[in-house]
Protein backbone atom coordinates (compact mmCIF):
# COMPACT_ATOMS: atom_id res chain seq x y z
CA UNK A 1 0.00 0.00 0.00
CA UNK A 2 1.28 3.46 -0.94
CA UNK A 3 1.28 5.62 2.17
CA UNK A 4 3.63 8.39 1.09
CA UNK A 5 2.85 11.94 0.08
CA UNK A 6 4.79 14.38 -2.06
CA UNK A 7 5.18 17.94 -0.86
CA UNK A 8 6.16 20.41 -3.57
CA UNK A 9 6.89 24.09 -3.89
CA UNK A 10 3.41 24.40 -5.37
CA UNK A 11 2.48 27.30 -7.63
CA UNK A 12 5.50 29.53 -8.01
CA UNK A 13 6.49 32.55 -10.03
CA UNK A 14 9.83 33.95 -11.06
CA UNK A 15 11.27 36.75 -13.11
CA UNK A 16 12.25 36.40 -16.73
CA UNK A 17 16.03 35.96 -16.90
CA UNK A 18 16.21 34.74 -13.33
CA UNK A 19 16.40 31.25 -11.86
CA UNK A 20 14.15 29.05 -9.77
CA UNK A 21 14.50 25.88 -7.73
CA UNK A 22 11.94 23.14 -8.31
CA UNK A 23 11.74 21.02 -5.18
CA UNK A 24 9.73 17.99 -4.14
CA UNK A 25 9.91 15.99 -0.94
CA UNK A 26 8.54 12.51 -0.35
CA UNK A 27 7.34 11.86 3.20
CA UNK A 28 5.25 9.42 5.25
CA UNK A 29 6.84 6.33 3.71
CA UNK A 30 9.89 4.19 4.38
CA UNK A 31 10.11 3.24 0.69
CA UNK A 32 13.53 3.49 -0.95
CA UNK A 33 13.78 6.22 -3.59
CA UNK A 34 15.55 4.63 -6.54
CA UNK A 35 15.10 7.40 -9.10
CA UNK A 36 13.50 10.81 -9.59
CA UNK A 37 12.49 11.98 -13.05
CA UNK A 38 11.78 15.63 -13.75
CA UNK A 39 9.43 16.45 -16.63
CA UNK A 40 8.11 19.64 -18.17
CA UNK A 41 4.74 18.84 -19.73
CA UNK A 42 5.76 16.09 -22.18
CA UNK A 43 9.54 16.63 -22.07
CA UNK A 44 12.03 14.75 -19.92
CA UNK A 45 14.28 17.37 -18.31
CA UNK A 46 16.48 15.38 -15.99
CA UNK A 47 16.85 12.16 -14.03
CA UNK A 48 18.52 11.50 -10.70
CA UNK A 49 19.27 7.82 -10.14
CA UNK A 50 20.46 6.41 -6.83
CA UNK A 51 23.27 4.49 -8.56
CA UNK A 52 24.06 6.53 -11.67
CA UNK A 53 23.60 10.06 -10.36
CA UNK A 54 22.23 12.82 -12.57
CA UNK A 55 21.43 12.86 -16.27
CA UNK A 56 20.37 16.19 -17.76
CA UNK A 57 18.70 16.04 -21.18
CA UNK A 58 21.16 17.52 -23.69
CA UNK A 59 18.69 20.10 -24.99
CA UNK A 60 18.36 21.55 -21.46
CA UNK A 61 21.99 21.29 -20.35
CA UNK A 62 22.66 25.01 -20.68
CA UNK A 63 19.74 26.05 -18.48
CA UNK A 64 19.14 23.20 -16.07
CA UNK A 65 21.35 22.37 -13.10
CA UNK A 66 20.98 19.38 -10.78
CA UNK A 67 20.03 19.98 -7.18
CA UNK A 68 19.84 21.01 -4.51
CA UNK A 69 19.27 17.44 -3.37
CA UNK A 70 16.77 15.76 -5.65
CA UNK A 71 15.50 19.14 -6.82
CA UNK A 72 16.21 20.94 -10.07
CA UNK A 73 17.38 24.47 -10.76
CA UNK A 74 16.12 26.26 -13.87
CA UNK A 75 18.25 29.16 -15.05
CA UNK A 76 17.90 32.00 -17.58
CA UNK A 77 14.14 31.73 -17.44
CA UNK A 78 11.99 32.74 -20.39
CA UNK A 79 8.22 33.15 -20.64
CA UNK A 80 8.19 29.87 -22.58
CA UNK A 81 9.22 28.12 -19.35
CA UNK A 82 5.79 28.90 -17.91
CA UNK A 83 3.83 25.71 -17.34
CA UNK A 84 3.56 22.47 -15.41
CA UNK A 85 6.55 20.57 -14.04
CA UNK A 86 6.40 17.09 -12.57
CA UNK A 87 8.67 15.25 -10.16
CA UNK A 88 8.21 11.51 -10.52
CA UNK A 89 9.57 9.49 -7.63
CA UNK A 90 10.28 5.84 -8.39
CA UNK A 91 10.34 3.98 -5.11
CA UNK A 92 10.69 0.44 -3.82
CA UNK A 93 8.50 -1.25 -2.89
CA UNK A 94 5.75 1.38 -3.08
CA UNK A 95 5.94 2.27 -6.77
CA UNK A 96 5.61 5.70 -8.34
CA UNK A 97 4.67 9.01 -6.70
CA UNK A 98 4.12 12.16 -8.75
CA UNK A 99 4.22 15.78 -7.66
CA UNK A 100 3.14 18.82 -9.69
CA UNK A 101 4.55 22.33 -9.72
CA UNK A 102 3.18 25.20 -11.76
CA UNK A 103 5.73 27.84 -12.72
CA UNK A 104 4.80 31.24 -14.06
CA UNK A 105 7.61 33.31 -15.53
CA UNK A 106 6.79 36.99 -15.25
CA UNK A 107 8.03 39.94 -17.26
CA UNK A 108 7.62 42.16 -14.23
CA UNK A 109 9.98 42.35 -11.28
CA UNK A 110 7.21 41.29 -8.92
CA UNK A 111 7.31 37.51 -8.58
CA UNK A 112 5.81 35.96 -5.50
CA UNK A 113 6.02 32.36 -4.37
CA UNK A 114 2.78 30.47 -3.88
CA UNK A 115 1.97 28.46 -0.79
CA UNK A 116 3.31 24.96 -0.32
CA UNK A 117 0.80 22.19 -0.86
CA UNK A 118 0.64 18.42 -0.83
CA UNK A 119 -0.32 15.83 -3.40
CA UNK A 120 -1.27 12.44 -1.96
Amino acid sequence: MMTGTIETTGNISAEKGGSIILQCHLSSTTAQVTQVNWEQQDQLLAICNADLGWHISPSFKDRVAPGPGLGLTLQSLTVNDTGEYFCIYHTYPDGTYTGRIFLEVLESSVAEHGARFQIP
Epitope: Q32, Q35, E39, I47, N49, D51, L52, H55, S57, Y92
Partner: antibody, heavy 118, light 107 residues
Framework: EVQLLESGGGLVQPGGSLRLSCAAS????????MSWVRQAPGKGLEWVSS????????YYADSVKGRFTISRDNSKNTLYLQMNSLRAEDTAVYYC???????????WGQGTLVTVSS | DIQMTQSPSSLSASVGDRVTITCRAS??????LNWYQQKPGKAPKLLIY???SLQSGVPSRFSGSGSGTDFTLTISSLQPEDFATYYC?????????FGGGTKVEIK
Protein backbone atom coordinates in the same frame (compact mmCIF):
# COMPACT_ATOMS: atom_id res chain seq x y z
CA GLU B 1 34.92 0.00 -23.66
CA VAL B 2 31.48 -1.36 -22.81
CA GLN B 3 31.05 -4.97 -23.87
CA LEU B 4 28.18 -7.44 -23.47
CA LEU B 5 28.72 -11.04 -24.51
CA GLU B 6 25.84 -13.52 -24.55
CA SER B 7 26.26 -17.29 -24.39
CA GLY B 8 24.21 -20.40 -23.70
CA GLY B 9 22.05 -20.52 -26.80
CA GLY B 10 21.50 -23.66 -28.86
CA LEU B 11 19.02 -26.24 -30.03
CA VAL B 12 16.55 -27.54 -27.46
CA GLN B 13 13.39 -29.64 -27.67
CA PRO B 14 9.97 -28.21 -26.82
CA GLY B 15 9.46 -28.36 -23.07
CA GLY B 16 13.18 -28.19 -22.45
CA SER B 17 15.29 -25.62 -20.61
CA LEU B 18 18.24 -23.36 -21.34
CA ARG B 19 20.16 -20.82 -19.31
CA LEU B 20 21.52 -17.80 -21.13
CA SER B 21 24.38 -15.73 -19.73
CA CYS B 22 25.53 -12.20 -20.54
CA ALA B 23 29.03 -11.28 -19.42
CA ALA B 24 29.46 -7.53 -18.97
CA SER B 25 32.67 -5.52 -18.92
CA UNK B 26 33.84 -1.94 -19.27
CA UNK B 27 31.33 -0.40 -16.85
CA UNK B 28 30.05 -0.69 -13.30
CA UNK B 29 27.60 -3.52 -13.92
CA UNK B 30 25.93 -3.29 -10.51
CA UNK B 31 24.77 0.29 -11.19
CA UNK B 32 22.69 -0.47 -14.27
CA UNK B 33 19.34 -2.00 -14.99
CA MET B 34 19.66 -4.73 -17.61
CA SER B 35 17.25 -6.25 -20.12
CA TRP B 36 16.78 -9.20 -22.43
CA VAL B 37 15.28 -8.54 -25.87
CA ARG B 38 14.64 -11.20 -28.50
CA GLN B 39 14.12 -11.28 -32.24
CA ALA B 40 12.47 -14.20 -34.01
CA PRO B 41 13.89 -15.00 -37.47
CA GLY B 42 12.80 -12.34 -39.94
CA LYS B 43 10.72 -10.53 -37.30
CA GLY B 44 10.94 -7.40 -35.17
CA LEU B 45 12.26 -6.81 -31.67
CA GLU B 46 10.40 -8.07 -28.60
CA TRP B 47 11.27 -7.14 -25.03
CA VAL B 48 11.50 -10.20 -22.76
CA SER B 49 12.55 -9.12 -19.27
CA SER B 50 14.31 -6.47 -17.19
CA UNK B 51 16.01 -6.37 -13.81
CA UNK B 52 16.72 -3.20 -11.84
CA UNK B 53 20.09 -2.41 -10.34
CA UNK B 54 19.40 -1.15 -6.85
CA UNK B 55 16.39 -3.27 -5.88
CA UNK B 56 16.72 -6.33 -8.08
CA UNK B 57 13.08 -5.88 -9.08
CA UNK B 58 12.19 -8.00 -12.10
CA TYR B 59 9.73 -7.49 -14.95
CA TYR B 60 8.55 -9.90 -17.65
CA ALA B 61 6.61 -9.94 -20.89
CA ASP B 62 3.32 -11.82 -20.57
CA SER B 63 4.53 -14.31 -23.17
CA VAL B 64 7.30 -15.58 -20.87
CA LYS B 65 5.90 -14.93 -17.39
CA GLY B 66 6.09 -18.02 -15.20
CA ARG B 67 8.52 -19.75 -17.58
CA PHE B 68 11.54 -17.43 -17.71
CA THR B 69 13.53 -16.01 -14.80
CA ILE B 70 15.95 -13.10 -15.05
CA SER B 71 18.72 -12.75 -12.48
CA ARG B 72 22.09 -11.13 -12.01
CA ASP B 73 25.31 -11.80 -10.17
CA ASN B 74 26.97 -8.44 -9.58
CA SER B 75 30.10 -10.10 -8.20
CA LYS B 76 30.56 -11.86 -11.55
CA ASN B 77 29.29 -8.98 -13.72
CA THR B 78 26.87 -11.40 -15.31
CA LEU B 79 23.20 -11.32 -16.30
CA TYR B 80 21.21 -14.54 -16.67
CA LEU B 81 18.00 -15.72 -18.27
CA GLN B 82 16.72 -19.12 -17.14
CA MET B 83 14.27 -20.39 -19.74
CA ASN B 84 12.00 -23.31 -18.88
CA SER B 85 9.09 -24.99 -20.67
CA LEU B 86 10.41 -23.74 -23.98
CA ARG B 87 8.08 -23.51 -26.97
CA ALA B 88 8.66 -23.29 -30.71
CA GLU B 89 7.64 -19.60 -30.58
CA ASP B 90 10.57 -18.88 -28.24
CA THR B 91 12.94 -19.49 -31.16
CA ALA B 92 14.85 -16.24 -31.59
CA VAL B 93 18.13 -14.43 -31.23
CA TYR B 94 18.33 -13.25 -27.62
CA TYR B 95 20.14 -9.99 -26.88
CA CYS B 96 21.12 -8.58 -23.52
CA UNK B 97 21.19 -4.81 -23.26
CA UNK B 98 22.20 -2.17 -20.75
CA UNK B 99 19.36 0.08 -19.63
CA UNK B 100 20.61 3.34 -18.07
CA UNK B 101 17.99 5.15 -16.01
CA UNK B 102 15.50 2.46 -17.15
CA UNK B 103 14.76 4.72 -20.10
CA UNK B 104 16.86 3.59 -23.06
CA UNK B 105 18.96 0.61 -24.20
CA UNK B 106 22.36 2.02 -25.03
CA UNK B 107 24.58 -1.04 -25.45
CA TRP B 108 23.59 -4.44 -26.83
CA GLY B 109 25.37 -7.77 -27.03
CA GLN B 110 25.85 -9.57 -30.32
CA GLY B 111 23.05 -12.01 -29.51
CA THR B 112 22.77 -15.77 -29.00
CA LEU B 113 20.45 -17.97 -31.06
CA VAL B 114 17.93 -20.19 -29.29
CA THR B 115 16.19 -22.78 -31.47
CA VAL B 116 13.29 -24.76 -30.03
CA SER B 117 12.51 -27.70 -32.27
CA SER B 118 11.92 -31.43 -32.11
CA ASP C 1 0.04 -2.60 -22.94
CA ILE C 2 1.15 0.38 -25.01
CA GLN C 3 1.08 -0.35 -28.73
CA MET C 4 3.67 1.30 -30.98
CA THR C 5 2.75 1.78 -34.63
CA GLN C 6 5.49 2.67 -37.08
CA SER C 7 5.02 3.94 -40.61
CA PRO C 8 5.86 3.27 -43.29
CA SER C 9 6.87 -0.37 -42.88
CA SER C 10 9.34 0.08 -45.72
CA LEU C 11 10.53 2.83 -48.01
CA SER C 12 12.88 3.25 -50.95
CA ALA C 13 15.15 6.25 -51.04
CA SER C 14 18.30 7.53 -52.70
CA VAL C 15 21.55 8.73 -51.18
CA GLY C 16 21.10 12.40 -50.22
CA ASP C 17 17.35 12.11 -49.68
CA ARG C 18 15.62 13.40 -46.58
CA VAL C 19 13.86 10.51 -44.88
CA THR C 20 11.14 10.70 -42.24
CA ILE C 21 9.82 7.79 -40.19
CA THR C 22 6.90 8.17 -37.81
CA CYS C 23 5.92 6.31 -34.67
CA ARG C 24 2.60 6.57 -32.86
CA ALA C 25 1.88 5.35 -29.33
CA SER C 26 -1.54 4.07 -28.30
CA UNK C 27 -1.45 6.41 -25.28
CA UNK C 28 0.67 9.33 -24.15
CA UNK C 29 4.24 8.31 -23.32
CA UNK C 30 5.60 11.81 -22.62
CA UNK C 31 9.06 11.76 -24.24
CA UNK C 32 9.94 8.18 -23.30
CA LEU C 33 10.61 7.17 -26.89
CA ASN C 34 13.83 5.77 -28.34
CA TRP C 35 14.99 5.01 -31.88
CA TYR C 36 17.30 2.16 -32.94
CA GLN C 37 19.01 1.18 -36.18
CA GLN C 38 19.59 -2.46 -37.05
CA LYS C 39 21.55 -3.93 -39.93
CA PRO C 40 21.17 -7.57 -41.03
CA GLY C 41 22.88 -10.01 -38.67
CA LYS C 42 23.81 -7.25 -36.22
CA ALA C 43 22.52 -6.04 -32.88
CA PRO C 44 20.37 -2.90 -32.74
CA LYS C 45 22.17 0.40 -32.20
CA LEU C 46 20.72 3.30 -30.19
CA LEU C 47 20.33 6.47 -32.26
CA ILE C 48 17.97 8.75 -30.33
CA TYR C 49 16.78 8.52 -26.72
CA UNK C 50 14.10 10.42 -24.82
CA UNK C 51 12.50 11.45 -28.13
CA UNK C 52 15.10 13.99 -29.20
CA SER C 53 18.48 13.36 -27.56
CA LEU C 54 21.21 12.22 -29.94
CA GLN C 55 23.19 9.28 -28.61
CA SER C 56 26.94 9.90 -28.34
CA GLY C 57 28.77 9.02 -31.55
CA VAL C 58 25.67 9.11 -33.77
CA PRO C 59 25.94 11.45 -36.79
CA SER C 60 24.02 14.70 -36.53
CA ARG C 61 22.04 13.94 -39.69
CA PHE C 62 19.81 11.85 -37.40
CA SER C 63 17.27 13.75 -35.35
CA GLY C 64 14.18 12.95 -33.34
CA SER C 65 11.14 14.98 -32.38
CA GLY C 66 7.72 14.64 -30.85
CA SER C 67 6.07 14.06 -27.48
CA GLY C 68 2.89 12.55 -26.16
CA THR C 69 1.77 10.08 -28.82
CA ASP C 70 3.40 11.19 -32.08
CA PHE C 71 7.12 10.96 -32.83
CA THR C 72 9.39 11.34 -35.82
CA LEU C 73 12.86 10.16 -36.79
CA THR C 74 14.45 12.22 -39.54
CA ILE C 75 17.59 11.49 -41.56
CA SER C 76 18.45 14.81 -43.15
CA SER C 77 20.66 13.44 -45.94
CA LEU C 78 20.63 9.67 -46.38
CA GLN C 79 24.07 8.05 -46.58
CA PRO C 80 24.94 4.60 -47.98
CA GLU C 81 25.52 3.23 -44.44
CA ASP C 82 22.02 4.32 -43.37
CA PHE C 83 20.23 1.60 -45.33
CA ALA C 84 18.90 -0.54 -42.48
CA THR C 85 15.80 -1.23 -40.41
CA TYR C 86 14.72 1.35 -37.82
CA TYR C 87 12.69 0.65 -34.68
CA CYS C 88 10.99 2.92 -32.17
CA UNK C 89 10.55 1.78 -28.56
CA UNK C 90 8.64 3.18 -25.61
CA UNK C 91 10.02 3.07 -22.07
CA UNK C 92 7.13 4.86 -20.36
CA UNK C 93 5.89 1.63 -18.80
CA UNK C 94 6.45 -2.10 -18.80
CA UNK C 95 6.10 -4.10 -20.88
CA UNK C 96 8.56 -2.18 -23.00
CA UNK C 97 7.24 -2.27 -26.55
CA PHE C 98 8.77 -1.75 -29.98
CA GLY C 99 7.31 -0.58 -33.24
CA GLY C 100 7.18 -3.07 -36.09
CA GLY C 101 10.17 -1.54 -37.83
CA THR C 102 10.79 0.49 -40.98
CA LYS C 103 13.10 -0.97 -43.61
CA VAL C 104 14.95 1.72 -45.56
CA GLU C 105 16.04 0.34 -48.93
CA ILE C 106 18.01 1.70 -51.85
CA LYS C 107 15.89 3.08 -54.68
Amino acid sequence: EVQLLESGGGLVQPGGSLRLSCAASGFTFSSYAMSWVRQAPGKGLEWVSSIKSNTGSTYYADSVKGRFTISRDNSKNTLYLQMNSLRAEDTAVYYCAREPYSVWLDYWGQGTLVTVSS
Amino acid sequence: DIQMTQSPSSLSASVGDRVTITCRASQSISSYLNWYQQKPGKAPKLLIYAASSLQSGVPSRFSGSGSGTDFTLTISSLQPEDFATYYCQQSYSTPLTFGGGTKVEIK
